[in-house]
Structures are given as C-alpha cells and as structure tokens.
C-alpha cells in the first residue's frame, strides 16, 4: 500500500537556529521515510532534508540548518513519503520567512515605579539577541496582581531604531505588586516567542483607597443606651499591600452636629454606646500620604420601623462554592449587606460581612468556610442610607455524621409501653442538619425494631411491647451524611400495670 499523501504541512523558522517543517500523518502503518524538498534564496537554490535510514524514518518532521537558512527569503516546500510500495508527494507549499519567524523571548530586567507618577510601572527589557536587527518587533505584555490567577494583556510595537526598550504600563492599582511577563515576534510573523521570565514590581503607595463600613445593633441596655458594634475594612478594590496607620471616627445625633464625638483607633472595630435617636457615623483611614474618602453609616432610631423586602432566600452548593440567592419585592434596592458567622452555642468567634451590589446572589468559596460547621447567613437590603429587615438562613458547606448520638432516657415504663426522650445534640457536634431520629429497640433474644421520626421530635412513645421483658434501645441522629447512635439504654416492662 502506498503511503498516505503528506498533508497539513506546517513550517516554522526558528531564527538563526533552523527551519523546521512538520506534517501529517505522523505515523504510518508500514515503514515510511520522507524527503522534504526545498527551494530557497528566492528559488535560486534547492536542497532536500531527508529521514532516509532506519533510525530516522517514520518521523514526520525535518529541519534545515544554517548556513543554508537565508533571511529574508521565500521557500517552496514539498514533502515526499516513500515506502516499499512507492512514493506519494504533497502539494507544493510556499513560505515567506518573515511570516513564520520565531525568535527568542526578550528578557525583562526591571519593573519599577517612577517617582511621583501614580499607578504606573515602567518595564525595561533587553531585546532578544537572536532577532533580526532591522525589524520592527511586536510585543505582548502580560500582567496580573501577585495574588490573582487572571492575566491581562497589552500589545504594542517597537521600531528597532527606537532602541528604547521600555514600556509604561498605566492605570494600575496603587501600592500593588504586579507580575509581568513579555513575549515578542517580528511584526509580520504569526509565531510569538515564548514568554520571558516573570518579574515583579510594585506601584507607588497612595492615601488609603476607602473603607467598607458596617454595624451590629445590640439590644438596648437597662439605662437606655444602645451598644452598636462598628466594624470596617479596606474597601473592595483597595490595594492588597495598603496599610492604614489608624482610623478616625466621628458621630452625632441627626440634625445635631454640636454633639459630635470623635474617636481615634488602630483597630478595625469599635463599640459605640448611643442614645435612642438616629445617629450618623463617619470613619476615615489614614496613612503617611493622607486620608481615605469618608465612609458613612446611618444608625436608625430605636423606634424606627425598618422596611422589609426580601421574600425568600435559598442556599445551595456547587462543586466549590456556596451560593445564596434571594428574591425581593423592591426593584429599587440594588445594594445588600451579607453577614455570616458560625452558629455555635457560645458567642461567635468570627463574624464576617460583605457588600453586594447589582445582584441578588452572593457566593463564597467553600474553602473559606469550615466543613461540618453550621453558618448563619443574613442578608440586609440597603436603600441609600436605610437598612432594611434582614432575611436569614443556615448552611453547611459540608455535612458529616454527628460526632455524638443523642443522650436518651426511658420514662413512664408500663406493661406494654415506654416513653423515650432524648436531648438535642449540641450544635458543635451535629456536623450537619439533623434530618431525623431513628429509635432502635430489641427485646432480649428478640428481633430488632426501628421507628424514624422528624428532627423536631425529641420524645416518642413505644407501644405493643411485651410485658415483663428486658429491652435495649438507642436513638440514632442522622444528617445527609449518615447517622450516629446515642448511648444504649436498657429497661424492663412491668408485669402488672401500676396506676
């Protein structure tokens, strides 16, 4: 059988290294060797690259080497496949070396900010040594913040006569570390160099970008004062490296700036004790270069009616995220505050919050939450300076079987009946939503019976027991992940009824 006709011929000129062509099929059923016929020097010269011995056959590529690589030039290429049965020739293909030239990557030697120019980095590099001297090179600069996985790109060209191998990358974030990598190609070429070694640079520091501000309203104390826990953090989009030296807080009752109080702190939380009126609170952060824009919060009066607009909320899990979605009857509300914290028996150790804009869903990576912990999630609607009634739900990012089963006791033992009661498993040991309880009971040397009840039931009356018989019993609490048995108890039914 004749070899297959060589097709999909693809050639690339590795500048000052080789000119290599590849083709398909890559493997033939029978032993095949190949000849790549070439004309070069604009047709003046011809030669052949061949894989014509046993160690080099069946190899769908061939390379022409210096000094027979001329540039600029147009090459004509034809591939011949030969086996014991004959020869098959490809179509003739034509290659302009400028269009298929691949050069070495450039080398970035510095990425620096320029004194006094904000949000800019100047990249300096060395043009590849193995590149045509006179040609214009096109470049792609890739950059990302150091903690991001997503690259951004900018394209530009440099004439050789520039000899100015620098590029000013503008509109960056202040005081942020950026990773840079650069590739290049002759302007007419379809083949890019590889990417250069990555280099890191940091933009200049500025005054703080801004703050996100929130509060937790606590019940009024006996003396009528209201504790309000203020909390703030760097605004979304603020530089990762940004550090504040401190925070200034000032607050006053609405329409009464004469009663302004001020506080300075280096913490990101502060408890205020306010009266029953409406208050306005302002916070700024500052560093050696200046202050951030003011973050503002309105604390409603104690008796103020808050609006309610969230009608329903669902929490669902995807492969790697927890997604909370809600439905609202107020289309004008487009900002929401989400709070989440572990539902534990004691005071929660960690409290988190985040603003959501122009969406009615919120997502968090599963790995930011602890598995087997129940989280309380509340969503507050925010309309301008008003905060509405929250809607709350609970969620686990991963359920497990309970760490302990229910503690059980037998009450009201009768001749044929018994009432079983059990305690709720402590929150810290549930490891998931308890969806039901199963009571397993068995007479001595008898068959085991079971009864499953809803999770809101903590007591059950067993009937149709045998009089004067010893029973063993245990209750299993189940989550979606499975069940855990509680302690086993024993009881004996009475021989006669005791009134």
């Amino acid at each position: 059988v004749l070899p297959a006709k060589p097709e999909n011929i693809s050639c690339i000129f590795y500048y000052e290294e080789n000119f290599t062509c590849t083709w398909s099929p890559e493997k033939e059923a029978s032993y095949t060797w190949y000849k790549v016929k070439r004309t070069y020097s604009y047709g003046y010269k011809s030669d052949i690259c061949s894989t014509d011995n046993s160690t080099r056959g069946n190899h769908a590529s061939c390379s022409f080497l210096p000094p027979t690589i001329t540039n600029p030039d147009n090459y004509t290429i034809q591939v011949e496949a030969q086996n014991a049965d004959g020869i098959m020739k490809s179509d003739i293909t034509y290659w302009n070396l400028d269009a298929i030239m691949k050069i070495e990557p450039p080398e970035i030697f510095s990425v620096k900010s320029v004194l006094g120019i904000k949000r800019m980095l100047q990249i300096k590099w060395i043009r590849p040594v193995l590149a045509p001297h006179s040609s214009t090179l096109k470049y792609t600069l890739r950059f990302r913040t150091i903690n991001s996985a997503y690259w951004m790109e900018v394209n530009f060209t440099k004439e050789d006569i520039d000899r100015d191998e620098t590029y000013n990358l503008t509109e960056l974030q202040a005081f942020t570390e950026y990773v840079m990598t650069l590739r290049c190609a002759p302007a007419e070429s379809m083949f890019w160099s590889g990417w250069s070694q990555e280099k890191v640079g940091t933009t200049e520091e500025e005054a703080p970008y801004g703050l996100d501000l929130w509060r937790v309203l606590k019940p009024a104390m006996v003396d009528g004062r209201r504790p309000v826990q203020l909390m703030w953090k760097k605004a979304t989009g603020a530089p990762v490296l940004e550090k504040a030296l401190g925070y200034n807080i000032w607050y006053f009752p609405e329409n009464n700036t004469n009663l302004t109080e001020t506080v300075n702190t280096t913490n990101q939380t502060h408890e205020l004790y306010l009266g029953g009126k409406t208050y306005w609170v302002y916070v700024v952060s500052y560093n050696s270069l200046g202050e951030s824009p003011v973050a503002t919060l309105r604390i409603p009066a104690l008796n103020e009616k808050t609006f309610q607009c969230i009608e329903a909320m669902q929490a669902c899990l995807t492969q790697d995220q927890l997604v909370v979605e809600w439905q609202s009857s107020a289309p004008e509300v487009d900002t929401w505050m989400v709070e989440w914290f572990p539902d534990v028996d004691s005071e929660p150790s960690s409290f988190s919050w985040e603003s959501v804009s122009q969406a009615r869903n919120w997502t968090i990576q599963k790995d930011e939450l602890k598995p087997l912990w129940c989280y309380n999630i509340s969503v507050y609607p925010v309309l301008r300076d008003r905060v509405g009634q929250p809607y709350s739900t609970q969620a686990y990012v991963q359920e497990g079987i309970p760490s302990a089963g229910p503690v059980t006791q037998a009450d009201s033992i009768g001749v044929k009946t018994v009432t079983i009661t059990w305690k709720e498993i402590p929150k810290s040991k549930r490891n998931g939503f308890i969806k039901n309880y199963t009571i397993f009971y068995q007479a001595e040397d008898g068959k085991e019976f079971s009864k499953t009840v809803n999770s809101n039931i903590l007591q059950y009356r067993l009937e149709s027991l045998t009089r004067r018989t010893s029973y063993s019993l245990q209750v299993m609490a189940s989550t979606n992940a499975g069940g855990t048995n509680g302690t086993k108890i024993n009881f004996k039914t009475l021989s006669i009824s005791v009134l």
Epitope: T39, Y44, S46, R56
Partner: antibody
Framework: EVQLVESGGDLVKPGGSLRLSCVAS????????MSWVRQAPGKGLQWVSG????????GYADAVKGRFTISRDNARNTVYLQMNSLRAEDTAVYYC????????????????????????WGQGTLVTVSS | EVVMIQTPLSLSVSPGEPASISCRAS???????LVWYLQKPGQSPQLLIY???SRATGVSDRFSGSGSGTDFTLRISRVEAEDVGVYYC?????????FGQGTKVEIK
C-alpha cells in the same frame, strides 16, 4: 537510461528568435532542476539559465537577461529556452543539463541533506547567429 | 557576479604523476556549492566533484577536491591517459552561477 535530447538549434539572423527544447527521459522529470549551459566555439562553459524542480526560475546570466526565457512543461518532460533579440555573441553549442539532489557526507544532526548539482548533460544543439 | 579564476590554464603531465588545479573565487563561496567538471575532447562535460570534496558516482578515487572560502583545489593523484580534457570549476552559491575559464590537461 537517463537521456536529455536538445533540439531547435539553427542558423538565425541577428535580432531573430529561436526556441530550444530539451526532452528528458529515464527519470521522474518534476523531481529535478534543469539548466541551459552554452559553449561558444573554442571557448569555455557559460551557464545561461535554470529552472528549479518547483517551476521557479533560478535566474539568468547577465549576458542574456531580458532576452531569454526558461520554462518547463512537466507533462511533456520538456524544458524550453526561448531566445529573442539574438546577437552574434550568442553563437554556441547549447547544452541542456539536469540538476540532481546529491547527498553530501553526513553533516550531523538528525537528518541527511542533499544539494542540487548538474550531473547529466545532453549532447548539445548548435545555435548560429549570423547575417 | 562571482568571477572564478583557474590556474594554470593548461597543464602537461606525465602518466602516473600528480596534478593540481586551483580555482579562486572573487568572493567567498560556500563549500557546498563548489563543483568540478571534466569535458573530454568532443564530449559533453561530466560531473567529477560536488560540494568541494564529494566524488560523483563512478569517479575514480584518484580525484580529490578541497578548499574553502575563496580558494579551492582539484587534485589528481596519478594522471592517466583517460584524464585528458578541460577541467572547469563552477560556483552555485551566488547568482548567477559562474564557471572558471577552464584548465586544459594533456599527457606528456
């Protein structure tokens, strides 16, 4: 047997035209380059023109540039030399020659390389330009 | 164009004696593209040496070629009667292809 047979040589007046033909046999014609080489009476060899295996013109000697045209017809296994504006100094025996890929000693690396050289010559056809 | 100068223009050699012909190019020529031909009396030329030093099929090992850059040499280790004729060098490296003017070898 590899053979090259030239024809078309004749006596022609200066300024006249002539077309030389060279019919090849005994080899796969379109794998080879072809050249025309001439030899004036009692003189040395002069390369006139050539055409590569792909049908591209290799070039022309300065003395014939703009007057002579080389072409090939692979279907007929024939190479042509169209000669216009002939001059007395074009008088010569015109040889048709085959350019074959010959392997140079192993140059190292993963592949073998062949370069094209004139390895077969025809018997020649005489062109005389005279008034 | 590249001018190829051969020396000597004629050479008379006794049978069994060595002979040497020089070919000098007016500019550098790749050794891949330097060729030697022999034209015996009344015949078409024939290929002797290609790529400066590779012998063509059927050529006696009495013939050898060497050189690089602008200087190339053809040597006949022991001249025989059948070696008479005109020897030409040719360069393929630069357009147009050019021949030397020829060296006539005869037997003493």
């Amino acid at each position: 047997e590899v053979q090259l047979v030239e024809s078309g040589g004749d006596l022609v007046k200066p300024g006249g035209s002539l077309r030389l033909s060279c019919v090849a046999s005994g080899f796969t014609f379109d794998d080879y380059g072809m050249s025309w080489v001439r030899q004036a009476p009692g003189k040395g060899l002069q390369w006139v023109s050539g055409i590569n295996w792909a049908g591209g013109t290799i070039g022309y000697a300065d003395a014939v540039k703009g007057r002579f045209t080389i072409s090939r017809d692979n279907a007929r296994n024939t190479v042509y030399l169209q000669m216009n504006s002939l001059r007395a100094e074009d008088t010569a025996v015109y040889y048709c020659a085959r350019e074959s890929p010959l392997r140079l000693g192993d140059l190292g690396g993963d592949y073998f390389y062949y370069y094209y050289y004139i390895d077969v010559w025809g018997q020649g056809t005489l062109v005389t330009v005279s008034s | 164009e590249v001018v190829m100068i051969q020396t000597p223009l004629s050479l008379s050699v006794s049978p069994g004696e060595p002979a040497s012909i020089s070919c000098r190019a007016s500019q550098s020529v790749s050794s891949r593209y330097l060729v030697w031909y022999l034209q015996k009396p009344g015949q078409s030329p024939q290929l002797l040496i290609y790529g400066t030093s590779s012998r063509a099929t059927g050529v006696s090992d009495r013939f050898s070629g060497s050189g690089s850059g602008t200087d190339f040499t053809l040597r006949i280790s022991r001249v025989e009667a059948e070696d008479v004729g005109v020897y030409y060098c040719q360069q393929y490296d630069n357009a147009p292809r050019t021949f030397g003017q020829g060296t006539k070898v005869e037997i003493k």
